[in-house]
């Protein structure tokens, strides 16, 4: 998912050289201090350098920019705005750079930015307008096609007094700027639920990764608008069962592959429809690996091997017969 480089030769800027010319306007294609540059590969790498801000003197040719493993803390508005603009920048990787705040318009003036990776940053404050750049109800379309937001949940004590899911979704939906987004990765974010409106407004999605969250149910989530969804990663969540509405929607998406491994499936009477569907469908990858977690008597049973007689629910006692 991250921008990669076929760079064979990188030039490095020695810090003392950079400081010697810092008073003068930057040369158009010089390499920033603490970075490695390859004009042939159109790639700049400023990796694991404890940078506290984005270098101002990035070369105009940069197409792939790695700013990983730094200490950026805050990404202000126009963090990558340059004159002339970084018109070629297509892939930007900011993962693991200790970002806790991304402000409105942080990625403005990057007309070719297709791929953005903010993974492994504790984003306590992600502006609703981080990706749209303005607070207009309909913003100019973002060029982003791939947005990687894996493990951006901050520690619990650093979260604002609002839903983390809500904060992320607000940024995804603001100004309807991300209508062209094709890949969205939201893995490992402790999501308890998926706000119901998010998918309806991202119609171009082809790949959606929600793995390693804490999703318990998809009952109120609709996939119907994701007409060309190709992969739906739901591994390592807390899903107990998929209900008929969800099953029918998934079956109605002709290009989808669904990944469901490592969920605590509850194999009681409510599982009957899902088991029937699993036996018939081709859309679930590795469906023969899905096993029951509950009730205890069903633990480790393979879902595909169950029949209706296996899937019972304990009768609910009338209140007069219940004991305290």
């Amino acid at each position: 998912s991250s921008p990669t480089s076929s760079a064979s030769s990188f030039s490095s800027s020695a810090p003392f050289l950079a400081s010697a010319v810092s008073a003068q306007p930057p040369l158009p294609d010089q390499c920033p201090a603490l970075c490695e540059c390859s004009e042939a590969a159109r790639t700049v790498k400023c990796v694991n350098r404890n940078l506290t801000e984005v270098p101002t003197d990035l070369p105009a040719y940069v197409r792939n920019l790695f700013l990983t493993g730094n200490q950026l803390a805050v990404l202000p508005a126009g963090a990558f705005a340059r004159r002339p603009p970084l018109a070629e920048l297509a892939a930007l990787n900011l993962s693991g750079s200790r970002l806790d705040e991304v402000r409105a318009g942080a990625f403005e003036h990057l007309p070719s930015l297709r791929q953005l990776d903010l993974s492994h940053n504790p984003l306590a404050d992600l502006s609703p307008f981080a990706f749209s750049g303005s607070n207009a109800s309909v913003s100019a379309p973002s060029p982003l096609v791939e947005l990687i937001l894996n493990h951006i949940v901050p520690p619990e004590d650093e979260r604002q007094n609002r839903s983390f899911e809500g904060m992320v979704v607000a940024a995804l939906l603001a100004g309807r700027a991300l209508q062209g987004l094709r890949r969205l990765e939201l893995a490992s974010n402790h999501f308890l639920y998926l706000p119901r409106d998010v998918l309806a407004q991202l119609p171009s999605l082809r790949h959606l990764d929600l793995s390693n969250n804490s999703l318990v149910s998809l009952t109120y989530v609709s996939f119907r608008n994701l007409t060309h969804l190709e992969s739906l990663h739901l591994e390592d969540n807390a899903l107990k069962v998929l209900h008929n509405g969800t099953l029918a929607e998934l079956q109605g998406l002709p290009h989808i592959r669904v990944f469901l491994d490592n969920n605590p499936w509850v194999c009681d009477c409510h599982m009957a429809d899902m088991v029937t569907w699993l036996k018939e469908t081709e859309v679930v990858q590795g469906k023969d690996r899905l096993t029951c977690a509950y009730p205890e008597k069903m633990r480790n049973r393979v879902l595909l091997e169950l029949n209706s007689a296996d899937l019972d629910c304990d009768p609910i006692l009338p209140p007069s017969l219940q004991t305290s």
């Epitope: 890949r183 007409t227 290009h255 592959r257």
Partner: antibody, heavy 115, light 107 residues
């Protein structure tokens, strides 16, 4: 932009097998699906099958009666279509096309089946 | 298999004309209808997917509409570079199937 580059033209005898390759290059956000489509001379388009490149899942058109096998090598971003028990009516241009809605197509590979 | 019937099989029109091509499916395809262009001796290009969504980089003079079993492809103002054969295709139900094509010529 996505570019799909197919292997060169082939001449085969009836009963033989042909294997065509399709390498995806360029743009990084291509689809997981790779389709193969046949176009006989002066004719329309016939979908042969597809592969989901990440896990190798395939769907085939029954019209090719088990003669087609589609594979993929994710390490080289290359997909392959093998057609066996060739007959003269298999003379055609074969296209690879990536995407659910076949967004991008290769340049085509002409296969001539002749004794 | 779903049969796709495209009409007309050929048509001749003048530059600037509005051109429409029809495609009928033998059963409901839930808007999973795509339109492709193939210029003589060239490869195939996707123009429109899911009935009416324009593929990236495709000029806005191309459009699509329809639902259920009946779909239409329109060129609002024919340009010389639009000389090609146009195909419809359904991707709702496997196996995917194509219409027979419409060969478009300039008068």
């Amino acid at each position: 932009e996505v570019q799909l580059v197919q292997s060169g033209a082939e001449v085969k005898k009836p009963g033989a097998t042909v294997k065509i390759s399709c390498k995806v290059s360029g743009y990084a956000f291509s689809s997981s699906w790779m389709n193969w489509v046949q176009q006989a001379p002066g004719k329309g388009l016939e979908w042969m099958g597809r592969i989901y490149r990440e896990d190798g899942h395939t769907n085939y058109n029954g019209k090719f009666k088990g003669r087609v096998t589609i594979t993929a090598d994710t390490s080289t971003d290359t997909a392959y279509m093998e057609l066996s028990s060739l007959r003269s009516e298999d003379t055609a241009v074969y296209y690879c096309a990536t995407g659910g809605a076949m967004d991008y197509w290769g340049q085509g590979t002409l296969v001539t089946v002749s004794s | 298999d779903i049969q796709m019937t495209q009409s007309p099989s050929s048509l001749s029109a003048s530059v600037g004309d509005r051109v429409t091509i029809s495609c009928r499916a033998s059963q409901d395809i839930s808007n999973y209808l795509n339109w492709y262009q193939q210029k003589p001796g060239k490869t195939v290009k996707l123009l429109i997917y899911y009935t009416s969504r324009l593929h990236s980089g495709v000029p806005s003079r191309f459009s699509g509409s329809g639902s259920g079993t009946d779909y239409t492809f329109t060129i609002s103002s024919l340009q010389p570079e639009d000389i090609a054969t146009y195909f419809c295709q359904q991707d709702n139900t496997l196996p995917w199937t194509f219409g027979g094509g419409t060969k478009l010529e300039i008068k």
